[in-house]
């Protein structure tokens, strides 16, 4: 029978008695930076080329005895998970291994850097097809390791890394915290986050997605035909490296941004039991389990978006938090969230020639998050239109006035500390979907975009009685680009997008009276691109 | 541990040279920063990655590394350049005393310095 992990990542249409999806990643080369490996294991024989690269520290302890099978165990297993004949994800992928971890599974940041440099030089000397680099290791936060990963990613290499097995915020570890790297957490057969001894998978905003990482049967270095179960975020990352190899083999021109968006899009949504994560990390941690796309082609028509959370701003009065999209992505909307509810909103602003999303803390607030909605929108021309606070009692409003520009997101930012506490709610005038409406004391920012065939619509869901959470989702074929709360709901903690659903969170309802001020309205902006759909049909 | 003495035999005791002047003092207003792992047991003091500014050429990296060795030698310190980076990041890996960090941070082209640290199989 198919091992549980391969079944989990396989779309139903591929599920047969044997796991044999089309095209096994044969156009892709996967580099593995790990322990030494047993390259003559029947699972990976002829598939893995052991490079002459080795940079490892001495083993600790005077009584340590090097035993080949122990030295090779981690790397052999991972090579098998990526491309193994029987238990591999991308059975056609070829691999190259670099030894950066010693027999105890320990390495150094400097050794890893030199390994990444070796890959870059190899790429320059002999350019091949798409490259995936698997980094099944973690250390403390390292500016230099993250910088090296960024450079390699900008050279067109896809880096996949383990989130870490420390049951902690992945942002505290490297390379997991590097934004350019695809960071993978681990789940088990019950779609629970993996527990490992007293610890377990890392979590948080630096994790891109999860993948099977417990009780994974793969090649064992004990003998050339042996198999063994291993667990960890390394195993999870190896699944995603294999999926990435499959996707890149089917579409070799995919950029890192496109690949990441596809990985997110085709993941299983909302299957992880979030109760395992610390309460303050649940909203930040993606509830996504990686899966292969149902077909290798035809995803190009979709408008892909993802949600990017900033680091926490910290509690000082003027503290701000910034969320950024990847270089190839467009920032289509910006929202903010504060657990205390004390915030001064958010705004989109230019930074280094690119739009970023900045959230503002308020006096007495415990801090804010900025939430960017980052999308793939080819040939897009986006700008931000701002209206300063209005004098009129009807509130502030701004719309997209340029010909052919559509509204993709609304943000509002205010200087007064407790906006809306004593003010009547502002009602959105009906029949004006292409504008953002806000409090008269807030400046309102509209994200307006022009792109071939782009069309957007506003969708609202209001609840008259107070509720801790109000949601509104975009229907099939439409993608959520903007998520905000209708002004006038003073107890709103913030708004954010989860997959294709706009979530507006409010303070604990027990503290709020059920007056009209208790009303909460979630506003979603849903878009689609007819141009992308047509282009896709023409290809087929 | 057995290799340690051997390693130090190879260390270069660089002599004072014409390169040890102030011809390329760091630009005004830019201060290089020092970083180290927040998890103490994972720190590897004595080995440092010196990261140079983005557009630094390989020849400048080598020259900066030699300058560090020369200036360290004048103060009676042994240093060893373990690797010169180019291709991804400009810089070099150096084995030296932590006492020399202040000196290294003032070298021309230096963006930041990071103490080496451990990484682990996950």
């Amino acid at each position: 029978s198919i091992p549980w992990n391969l079944e989990r990542i396989t779309p139903p249409r591929y599920r047969a008695d044997e796991y044999q999806p089309p095209d096994g990643g044969s156009l892709v080369e996967v580099y593995l930076l790990d322990t030494s490996i047993q390259s003559d294991h029947r699972e990976i024989e002829g598939r893995v080329m052991v490079t002459d690269f080795e940079n490892v520290p001495e083993e600790d302890g005077t009584r340590f005895h090097r035993q080949a099978s122990k030295c090779d165990s981690h790397g052999t297993h991972l090579a098998g998970v990526v491309s193994g004949r029987d238990a591999g994800v991308a059975k056609g992928a070829s691999m190259r291994s670099l030894r950066v971890l010693n027999c105890q599974g320990k390495g150094t940041v400097s050794g890893t850097l030199i390994g990444l440099e070796f890959i870059r030089k190899s790429q320059l000397v002999q350019p091949v097809g798409p490259l995936v680099v698997l980094l099944p290791l973690a250390g403390g936060y390292s500016r230099v390791l993250n910088a090296a990963c960024q450079r390699l990613a900008r050279a067109g290499v896809v880096l996949v890394t383990a989130a870490g097995n420390f049951r902690d915020d992945a942002c505290l570890y490297s390379p997991a915290s590097a934004p350019e790297v695809i960071t993978v957490g681990a789940t088990n057969a019950q779609d629970q986050p993996v527990t490992l001894g007293t610890l377990g998978t890392n979590f948080g905003r630096c994790v891109d997605l999860f993948a099977p990482g417990e009780d994974i049967i793969g090649a064992s270095s004990d003998c050339s035909t042996c198999f063994v179960s291993q667990s960890g975020t390394s195993q999870a990352a190896a699944h995603v490296a294999g999926i990435a190899a499959m996707m890149l083999s089917a579409e070799p021109e995919l950029t890192l941004a496109e690949l990441r968006q596809r990985l997110i899009h085709f993941s299983a949504k909302d299957v992880i039991n979030e109760a395992w994560f610390p309460e303050d990390q649940r909203v930040l941690t993606p509830n996504l389990v990686a899966a292969l796309p149902p077909s290798t082609h035809g995803a190009g028509w979709q408008l892909f978006c993802r949600t990017v959370w900033s680091a926490h701003s910290g509690p000082t009065r003027m503290a701000t938090a910034v969320a950024r999209c990847a270089p190839d992505e467009e920032l289509l909307s910006c929202s903010s969230f504060s657990r205390s509810g004390k915030r001064r909103g958010e705004r989109m602003e230019a930074q280094g020639g690119k739009l970023v999303c900045r959230a503002h803390n308020a006096f007495g607030g415990e801090g804010v998050y900025a939430i960017a909605r980052c999308c793939l929108l080819p040939q897009a021309n986006c700008s931000v239109h701002t209206a300063p606070p209005a004098e009129a009692s009807m509130g502030t409003r701004v719309h997209c006035h340029q010909q052919g520009h559509v509204l993709t997101g609304c943000s509002s930012h205010w200087e007064v500390e407790d906006l809306g506490t004593h003010k009547p709610p502002v009602l959105r005038p009906r029949g004006q979907p292409n504008q953002c409406v806000g409090h008269r004391e807030a400046s309102i920012h509209a994200s307006c975009c022009h792109a071939p065939g782009l069309e957007c619509k506003v969708k609202e869901h209001g609840i008259p009685a107070p509720q801790e959470q109000v949601t509104v989702a975009c229907e099939e074929g439409w993608t959520l680009t903007g998520c905000s709360a209708l002004p006038g709901t003073s107890h709103v903690l913030g708004a954010y997008a989860v997959d294709n659903t706009c979530v507006v969170r409010s303070r604990d309802v027990s503290t709020t009276g059920s007056t009209s001020e208790g009303a909460v309205t979630a506003v979603a902006i849903c878009c689609r691109s007819r141009h992308l759909a047509q282009a896709s049909q023409e290809l087929q | 541990q057995e290799d340690e003495d051997g390693d130090y035999e190879e260390l270069v005791l660089a002599l004072r040279s014409e390169e040890d002047g102030l011809a390329e003092a760091p630009e005004h207003g830019t201060t290089a920063t020092f970083h180290r792992c927040a998890k103490d047991p994972w720190r590897l003091p004595g080995t440092y990655v010196v990261v140079l500014k983005e557009e630094t050429h390989l020849s400048q990296s080598e020259r900066t590394a030699r300058r560090l060795q020369a200036q360290a030698a004048r103060r009676g310190y042994l240093t060893k350049i373990l690797h010169v980076f180019h291709g991804l990041l400009p810089g070099f890996l150096v084995k030296m005393s932590g006492d020399l960090l202040e000196l290294a941070l003032k070298l021309p082209h230096v963006d930041y310095i990071e103490e080496d640290s451990s990484v682990f199989a996950q």
Partner: antibody, heavy 130, light 107 residues
Framework: EVQLVESGGGLVQPGGSLRLSCAAS????????MSWVRQAPGKGLEWVAN????????YYVDSVKGRFTISRDIAKNSLYLQMNSLRAEDTAVYYC???????????????????????WGQGTTVTVSS | DIQMTQSPSTLSASVGDRVTITCRAS??????LAWYQQKPGKAPKLLIY???SLESGVPSRFSGSGSGTEFTLTISSLQPDDFATYYC?????????FGQGTKLEIK
């Protein structure tokens, strides 16, 4: 279907020897630790011994150390228990079982995470009596 | 060696009842605990591993909890098929010990 089938049980005199076998089918035999567990008539379960995937590590309950030897033949998908110097208190039904567990890395250490015995044979009876 | 003590030794209950069996370890075993069900003349069957993880194919009325030294097996609504003997088992450094068993019988 995953199956374990024990054989080799029987009546033996105290001080005698027996060799139990366990044939595995439908499982990747070499992927798992394997155990022998026994159950004396009317009593509870007692773990006897286990062996690593490649046979390189073996562990025994104190009462059988030096008398029993666990081994495996990966090529034959078989597990064995050689029992010497048998005593009356060794009388029991002997089960072979698959130990399900997983390895994971800690900070510079390689650890085993045990789940439980998820596949069992039907048992073979050993009677030690004069 | 770590000793495992199960209580009660015998438990009488009726179909539909919620029953709890306790297992105590003589020293901390973290979550290294499994629960088994055994019917007369049959081999044991794994129900719960890692103290609280349900083995695949086992009905969801079975649940496990606890860590350290105190563990419980709960059957939320007893079914006729559940009358059997239940064993807990600890794992420590590649050696195992079982509890003495709890016989669950019809009241």
């Amino acid at each position: 279907e995953v199956q374990l089938v024990e054989s080799g049980g029987g009546l033996v005199q105290p001080g005698g020897s027996l060799r139990l076998s366990c044939a595995a089918s439908g499982i990747t035999f070499s992927s798992y630790w394997m155990s022998w567990v026994r159950q004396a008539p009317g009593k509870g379960l007692e773990w006897v011994a286990n062996i690593k995937q490649d046979g390189s590590e073996k562990y025994y309950v104190d009462s059988v150390k030096g008398r029993f030897t666990i081994s495996r033949d990966i090529a034959k998908n078989s597990l064995y228990l050689q029992m010497n110097s048998l005593r009356a208190e060794d009388t029991a039904v002997y089960y072979c079982a698959r130990d399900r567990g997983t390895y994971y890395y800690g900070i510079g250490s390689y650890n085993y995470y045990y789940y439980g015995m998820d596949v069992w044979g039907q048992g073979t009876t050993v009677t030690v009596s004069s | 060696d770590i000793q495992m003590t199960q209580s009660p030794s015998t438990l009488s209950a009726s179909v539909g009842d919620r029953v709890t069996i306790t297992c105590r370890a003589s020293q901390s075993i973290s979550s290294w605990l499994a629960w088994y069900q055994q019917k007369p003349g049959k081999a044991p069957k794994l129900l719960i591993y890692k103290a609280s993880s349900l083995e695949s194919g086992v009905p969801s009325r079975f649940s496990g909890s606890g860590s350290g030294t105190e563990f419980t097996l709960t059957i939320s609504s007893l079914q006729p098929d559940d009358f059997a003997t239940y064993y807990c088992q600890q794992y420590n450094s590649y050696s195992y010990t079982f509890g003495q068993g709890t016989k669950l019988e019809i009241k």
